[in-house]
């Protein structure tokens, strides 16, 4: 059995342009004033980190600045949004969710979102 | 200050029944997973039993060696968890802690297994 | 279930060494690991958490790291207090699984 319920879709289309959104929920045990959220790529049986953020329950979620993430949260939901997403970025993206303050220490894995890109097809020549 | 103080150890017969308790405090019990693990010189530590909390309807889980046999139970009013522990074995023998999540630990309370 | 392998299972070093204790997980376990001191005669101490976040009240000397399959520990600058047996333990699927422990000594 895995440790703390963390749900999110199934499966998601990006936009034509490279923009994907899901939420991720989790089940808190606990009142947890310290939430970290890390998105994960998995493909073939490689797992990296796409992006992470640790937010303070009540405040906005702060990615890196060079991040291709962005998000909200509203109580145990997390709104992720992925920007620059290409063909040969489509793959599961699991969320991770920790709860890191006060004790204890409570972390839940998602089953993964599978994300379709799609490239969009240049536009054709015009002859004036 | 948190404390956790197990008690209810001691020397058992094989086959026969014990009853391991746990009190807490310093710590909002009611937030807790609360678990048993055990301490044996040939085992190192190992992970006995847990107990969720009410958002998880008070789930419990057991590690293959003690299912069927042994039962976890709390009662938040008393910021108490439980272990009732069926037909011991002399491979049930070591020191049982008390966890909240796995950040706090008891004392521990031994129980021996022996005719 | 998750087997932990850790290693070594025993180690000796001088004060003012640095020693690294890794552990091995049969899966990716996402990073759900806990590291933690167990002295003689006392209770098992919760020093590291979810791979890398160091518990209240333990020495900034010890570090944790990995993901996927492999974490390791860290101590730094080593005491005569760090004498003890370390554990790892897969944190995110029951059965909660320990390594073997590591025996650290003093030379």
């Known amino acids: 059995c895995k440790a703390m319920h963390v749900a999110q879709p199934a499966v998601v289309l990006a936009s034509s342009r490279g923009i994907a959104s899901f939420v991720c929920e989790y089940a808190s045990p606990g009142k947890a004033t310290e939430v970290r959220v890390t998105v994960l790529r998995q493909a073939d049986s490689q797992v990296t980190e796409v992006c992470a953020a640790t937010y303070m329950m009540g405040n906005e979620l702060t990615f890196l600045d060079d991040s291709i993430c962005t998000g909200t949260s509203s109580g145990n939901q997390v709104n992720l949004t992925i920007q620059g997403l290409r063909a040969m970025d489509t793959g599961l993206y699991i969320c991770k969710v920790e709860l890191m303050y006060p004790p204890p220490y409570y972390l839940g894995i998602g089953n993964g979102t599978q994300i379709y890109v799609i490239d969009p097809e240049p536009c054709p020549d015009s002859d004036f | 200050e948190v404390k956790l103080d197990e008690t209810g150890g001691g020397l058992v017969q094989p086959g026969r029944p014990i009853k391991l308790s746990c009190v807490a405090s310093g710590f909002t019990f009611s937030d807790n997973w609360m678990n048993w693990v055990r301490q044996s010189p040939e085992k190192g530590l190992e992970w006995v039993a847990q107990i969720r909390n009410k958002p998880y309807n008070y789930e419990t889980y057991y590690s293959d060696s003690v299912k069927g046999r042994f039962t976890i139970s709390r009662d938040d009013s008393k910021s108490s968890v439980y272990l009732q522990m069926n037909n011991l074995r002399t491979k049930d023998m070591g020191i049982y802690y008390c966890t909240g999540g796995f950040t706090y630990w008891g004392q521990g309370t031994l129980v021996t297994v022996s005719a | 279930d998750i087997q932990m392998t850790q290693s070594p299972p025993s180690l000796s070093a001088s004060v003012g060494e640095t020693v690294t204790i890794t552990c091995g997980a049969s899966e990716n376990i996402y990073g759900g690991l806990n590291w933690y001191q167990r002295k003689q005669g006392k209770s098992p101490q919760l020093l590291i958490y979810?791979?890398?976040n160091l518990a209240d009240g333990m020495s900034s000397r010890f570090s944790g790291s990995g993901s996927g399959r492999q974490y390791s520990l860290k101590i730094s600058r080593l005491h005569p207090d760090d004498v003890a047996t370390y554990y790892c333990q897969n944190v995110l699927n029951t059965p909660y699984t320990f390594g073997g422990g590591t025996k650290l000594e003093i030379k």
């Open positions: 979810g791979a890398t």
